[in-house]
């Protein structure tokens, strides 16, 4: 049997060592003990008694099925306990009695049906994070379950087989920053929602089939809900159930952010909320994020005209990796307050973008992200976006563009342009002179000779440049990142010619450790203040005898340098 490995600070690693019991020889010097992924099955009352100063105990996936009632009695200093993914079919309050310092407790993935006969947590007054439940057997949430818990930073409940929720069970916790609920059906959603209205600031609903969700008024008095964020992950919705979900928003008037991740919409976007919902809901929602939305019939998707008025105040929208190929003009025109739009990893081409960025579209838009779409012409893209009078920042990275033409038109306020990973080989005057930040990293550039009088930040890493660009091109440059190119040297004169340069990241280049370069680096200790990742990323490529040495450590031969 293998043994534990411990470091000087008392952190002991015993993961995946085939332990069949808690190893002997544990001491009070241990601060952290990880026995995850073993075959321990049983923890006896004396197994951990020596660990009086233990702060972290991890026993994830160790096949534990029995823990003696007083097994943790000496762990008064314990702050982090992970018992997840074991074989504990019942939970005992006696385990947790002594753990008054506990901040993190993970009991998830054990085959219990309820959280024990009596309240488990009354003594855990410092608890901040609690994870409970499982996929198959956890079927009941009761009023006694959370007794003694008044405030939690994170509560995660996996209740995919929930058959009974006792009303007010979650109400006893007065403050929950982030509640994650894994529910397979929406049967108890309204009851739970009513109980957490006054306590939860961020509600995350996972793996829930909401197709049959039906709203009914909640049995709550006037409540000022602190909920700011609502997220749906892996949920299934229909056009009808979306309308019903909207009705919940009248109870969470401070809501500012809504998120849908990995959801499926079995519908066409033919939402038809009642007039009262449209007027009052989404009042303070400023951020809507949708990632990997699956719409089986996305070619039939509606233009969302029925919810235009819902979205007029929204400031930030992300619709990422959701097969968007066109945003209808009228929809764009109704997004009057929109300042940030991210359409990354979609299917937009310039010719359909033209429809989306029509006259009057996105009148307040400042930042547009079209990374990894199907854009092909930089010239057309710039021209199409001329309608966006307030656009300052454009990310068109990870599109494969045709060669850059000599001249292009861009929105006149544009200050930031991301052209990274676009396959460009040459930069031309197509790039606007108004830029303050330009990212052309991860391309095929072997030179950069474009005058950009306002440029403050240049990101040009992962290209093929052999020298630093000429400083006269960027009179006000503050930051240059040029790592992973083929730069062989830099000198005092070169660096000195950038009058305002504060940060230079030039590591992982092919430095020729000449006498000049090495004497410059030795004479200039202040390099550490300007060079990011100095000295570890600055290595000699040649001459052969210095290959792999740090510039800082490399010493030129006296013979070579005094010829």
């Amino acid at each position: 049997q293998e043994s534990l490995s411990c470091d000087a600070s008392g952190v002991c690693d015993g993961r995946s060592r085939s332990f069949t019991s808690i190893p002997s020889g544990l001491t009070a010097a241990m601060k952290s003990l990880d026995l995850s992924f073993n075959k321990i099955t049983y923890i006896g009352h004396g197994d951990l008694r020596a660990c009086a100063n233990l702060q972290v105990l991890m026993l994830k996936s160790s096949r534990i099925n029995t823990i003696e009632g007083d097994a943790f009695y000496s762990l008064g200093s314990l702050e982090h306990l992970d018992l997840s993914d074991n074989h504990l079919s019942s939970l005992s309050s006696s385990w947790f009695g002594p753990l008054s310092s506990l901040k993190y407790l993970n009991l998830m993935g054990n085959p219990y049906q309820t959280l024990g006969v009596t309240s488990l947590f009354p003594n855990l007054t410092n608890l901040q994070t609690l994870r409970i439940g499982n996929v198959e057997t956890f079927s009941e949430i009761r009023r006694i379950d959370f007794a003694g818990l008044t405030s939690l930073n994170e509560l995660e409940i996996k209740a995919l087989s929930l058959r009974n929720y006792q009303s007010q069970s979650l109400k006893s916790i007065r403050d929950i920053h982030h509640l994650t609920l894994h529910l397979s059906e929406s049967a108890f959603l309204l009851e739970i929602f009513a109980d957490i209205l006054s306590s939860v600031r961020y509600l995350e609903l996972r793996d829930t089939n909401l197709a049959r969700f039906q709203f009914s008024p909640l049995p709550v008095d006037e409540v000022s809900s602190p909920m700011k964020k609502l997220a749906f992950r892996g949920s299934v919705l229909t056009d009808e159930s979306f309308n019903e979900l909207l009705k919940l928003l009248r109870y969470i008037l401070e809501l500012s952010e809504v998120e849908f991740d990995d959801c499926t919409l079995n519908g066409l976007g033919d939402f038809n909320p009642s007039e009262s919902d449209v007027v009052s809901e989404l009042g303070k929602v400023e951020t809507v994020t949708i990632r990997r939305l699956h719409i089986p019939q996305f070619y039939l998707f509606y233009d969302l005209s029925t919810v235009y008025s819902l979205l007029e105040k929204v400031k930030r929208i992300t619709v990422e990796n959701s097969k968007v190929f066109l945003v209808p003009c009228s929809f764009s025109q109704h997004l009057k307050s929109l300042e940030f739009l991210d359409l990354s990893e979609n299917l937009m081409v310039e010719e359909y973008l033209k429809n989306s960025a029509c006259k009057g579209a996105w009148p307040s838009l400042q930042t547009l992200v079209l990374s990894q779409n199907h854009l092909r012409s930089m010239q057309k893209t710039g021209e199409i976006l001329l309608t966006l009078k307030n656009l300052t920042s454009l990310d068109i990275s990870r599109n494969t563009f045709h060669p850059m033409p000599d001249s292009c038109q861009w929105p006149e306020k544009m200050r930031f342009l991301n052209l990274s990973s676009t396959g460009i080989r040459v930069v031309k005057t197509c790039i606007p002179q108004t830029l303050e930040v330009l990212d052309v990293s991860n391309n095929n550039l072997d030179s950069f000779s474009l005058f950009l009088p306002r440029l403050q930040e240049l990101y040009i890493s992962r290209n093929k440049l052999k020298t630093l660009p000429d400083a006269s091109l960027f009179p006000v440059l503050l930051v240059m990142k040029i790592r992973e190119n083929a730069v062989s040297t830099f000198s005092k004169d070169q660096l000195g010619s950038f009058p305002k340069l504060e940060t230079l990241e030039a590591g992982d280049n092919h430095f020729v450790c000449s006498c000049e370069l090495l004497s410059f680096t030795m004479e200039t200790p202040a390099l550490a203040q300007i060079l990011v990742d100095w000295p570890d990323s600055y290595l000699c490529d040649s001459p052969p005898r210095l290959h792999g040495h740090r510039l800082q450590d490399a010493r030129p031969s006296v013979l070579e340098c005094h010829q």
Epitope: K323, L326, L347, R398
Partner: antibody
């Protein structure tokens, strides 16, 4: 440059299955959909379906739902179409094509000729 | 399914003249201001080649003598002036509704 290289001609017996391949190069495979199109001898074009390599999602012409299975191997940037229970009706040239902008097929493979005959 | 009817099935034209091929859809292929209609050219023994997408956008690298027009259900492909290289098959294709469908094709011939 963008290329879709399809596997060579196939001669198979009725009732058998065949797996055609389409190897992509010159573009980010996971960013585009791959479509399959059938062209019978001296005939028009018939859309079979698409697959999106990024998430493996597929969509089929109902006429081919029980006939074709679409898969991808993102590590080799290759799309596959397996055709089952072949009959002489399935003898045709099969093209793979890259789907751009969600709506048009801008690059096509050279086609694979399938002959079903005993 | 949306049925696309191309006419004529074959068209005889003189080199240097204009050729117009029509494609009629059994229902509208409009999607909020964009017509999801494409045109492809196919030479014998070769795969189809994209000429026009979104009814009127000429694909990069396609000669300017090719143009597309139309909206709703009626679309046309124009070639002017016709060159010898153009005397091949042409197909329209809609991507408004699944399943995507192609027209039956129009064969260009020299008059």
């Amino acid at each position: 440059q963008v290329q879709l290289q399809q596997s060579g001609p196939e001669l198979v017996n009725p009732g058998a299955s065949v797996k055609l391949s389409c190897k992509a190069s010159g573009f980010t495979f996971t960013t585009y959909g791959i479509n399959w199109v059938k062209q019978g001898p001296g005939q028009g074009l018939e859309w079979i379906g698409w697959i999106y390599p990024r998430d493996g999602s597929t969509n089929f012409n109902e006429n081919f739902k029980d006939k074709a299975a679409l898969t991808v191997d993102t590590s080799s940037s290759t799309a596959y179409m397996e055709l089952h229970s072949l009959t002489s009706e399935d003898s045709a040239v099969y093209f793979c094509a890259r789907l751009t902008g969600g709506t048009f097929l801008d690059y096509w493979g050279q086609g694979t000729t399938l002959t079903v005959s005993s | 399914d949306i049925v696309l009817t191309q006419s004529p099935a074959s068209l005889a034209v003189s080199l240097g003249q204009r050729a117009t091929i029509s494609c009629r859809a059994s229902e509208s292929v409009e999607y909020y201001g964009t017509s999801l209609m494409q045109w492809y050219q196919q030479k014998p023994g070769q795969p189809p080649k994209l000429l026009i997408f979104g009814a009127s956008n000429v694909e990069s690298g396609v000669p300017v003598r090719f143009s597309g027009s139309g909206s709703g259900t009626d679309f046309s492909l124009n070639i002017h002036p016709v060159e010898e290289d153009d005397i091949v098959m042409y197909f329209c294709q809609q991507s408004r509704k699944l399943p995507w469908t192609f027209g039956g094709g129009t064969k260009l011939e020299i008059k």
